[in-house]
Interface confidence: low
């Protein structure tokens, strides 16, 4: 999906008002220094591409973030503020329904959500800061 046509300011507002809080809730009890941020993005469409990938694509050790509250709100924001996004996600959603809900927050999932927090922060300051 091409994220260049999204309403970035509306998505930013959704992140600041709810998504950020849900990410913090998910990470509660984890030290902010526990994970190193290895994923970055250089502008807002690029950030949304990476955010979508980490939020909705199952990875080894963390298969089902998509049913978390922050993920559902992310999906809603993208569906509302990115023209045509919903249509591209129909197949992905059908595949997701076949997966079982995660019962335990694994360390891999915590690491992945930590990466997501970094991507969302970069989305709000969209320039790749190479350390």
């Amino acid at each position: 999906y091409d994220f260049t046509n999204c309403d970035f300011e509306k998505i930013k507002a959704a992140y600041l008002s709810t998504i950020s809080k849900d990410l913090i809730t998910y990470m509660s009890g984890t030290k902010s220094t526990e994970f190193n941020n290895t994923v970055s993005c250089s502008n807002r469409p690029h950030c949304l591409t990476e955010i979508q990938s980490l939020t909705f694509n199952p990875t080894a050790g963390c298969a089902s973030l998509a049913k978390e509250m922050f993920a559902m709100k992310t999906k809603a924001a993208l569906a509302i503020w990115c023209p045509g996004y919903s249509e591209t996600q129909i197949n992905a959603t059908q595949a997701m329904k076949k997966r079982r809900k995660r019962k335990v927050t694994t360390n891999k999932c915590l690491e992945q959500v930590s990466q997501l927090q970094g991507l969302w922060r970069r989305f709000n300051r969209p320039l790749l800061k190479q350390q």
Partner: antibody, heavy 117, light 107 residues
């Protein structure tokens, strides 16, 4: 409306330094990145570097590291670029320009730097 | 660094004609390309960003297209105020680089 105000010209001697200014108005200064771009007479555009006014983070084009230093004064919404050890190669028009996603939507009028003895 | 190659370097056309300027990136920059117009003695003005999105206030006779490494700027029905220099610039990642420019002159 958004404005980036730059002095029209600077005349300096070879080997000296110059600090040029760019005063921003009409928007929240700390919400946008401030870039500097060089244009030699009859030539194209060269990106020098960028500063984030919210935290003063800077990144430079490798070619201008050691030559340009970017700073800001958030109290006056002003960005500065200092150029050191000036030579005739530094004679050019220097623009400040702002961005959010790496493209430049508003530009200053440019400061013409002349390096001459 | 990503190199941007613009062609042609100069172009002569008449009022009312349609012209195209092309820009090639040395590597994939997806849709992260901007176009600027610069008139003699003036600052550049943003025309197009994200390869195809027109900047505010830019007439609809301007249009951008392309993705990946090949891009173009098309100007339909040239007007006298359209003559000047045009530059492409990738905004994919630092360092940002510009094309060498295209000088559009009146025939």
């Amino acid at each position: 409306q958004v404005q980036l105000q730059q002095p029209g010209a600077e005349l300096v001697k070879p080997g000296a330094s110059v600090k040029m200014s760019c005063k921003a108005s009409g928007y929240t200064f700390t919400s946008y990145w401030m870039h500097w771009v060089k244009q030699r007479p009859g030539q194209g555009l060269e990106w020098i570097g960028v500063i984030d006014p919210s935290d003063t983070y800077t990144t430079y084009n490798q070619k201008f590291k050691g030559k340009a230093t970017l700073t800001v004064d958030t109290s006056s919404s002003t960005a500065y670029m200092q150029l050191s050890s000036l030579t005739s190669e530094d004679s050019a028009v220097y623009y400040c320009t702002r961005s959010l996603d790496g493209f430049f939507d508003y530009w200053g009028q440019g400061t013409t730097l002349t390096v001459s003895s | 660094d990503i190199q941007m190659t613009q062609s042609p370097a100069s172009l002569s056309a008449s009022v009312g004609e349609t012209v195209s300027i092309t820009c090639r990136a040395s590597e994939n920059i997806y849709s992260y390309l901007a176009w600027y117009q610069q008139k003699q003695g003036k600052s550049p003005q943003l025309l197009v960003y994200f390869a195809k999105t027109l900047a505010a206030g830019v007439p609809s006779r301007f249009s951008g297209s392309g993705s990946g490494t090949q891009f173009s700027l098309k100007i339909n029905s040239l007007q006298p105020e359209d003559f000047g220099n045009y530059y492409c610039q990738h905004h994919y990642d630092t360092p940002w680089t510009f094309g060498g420019g295209t000088k559009l002159e009146i025939k």
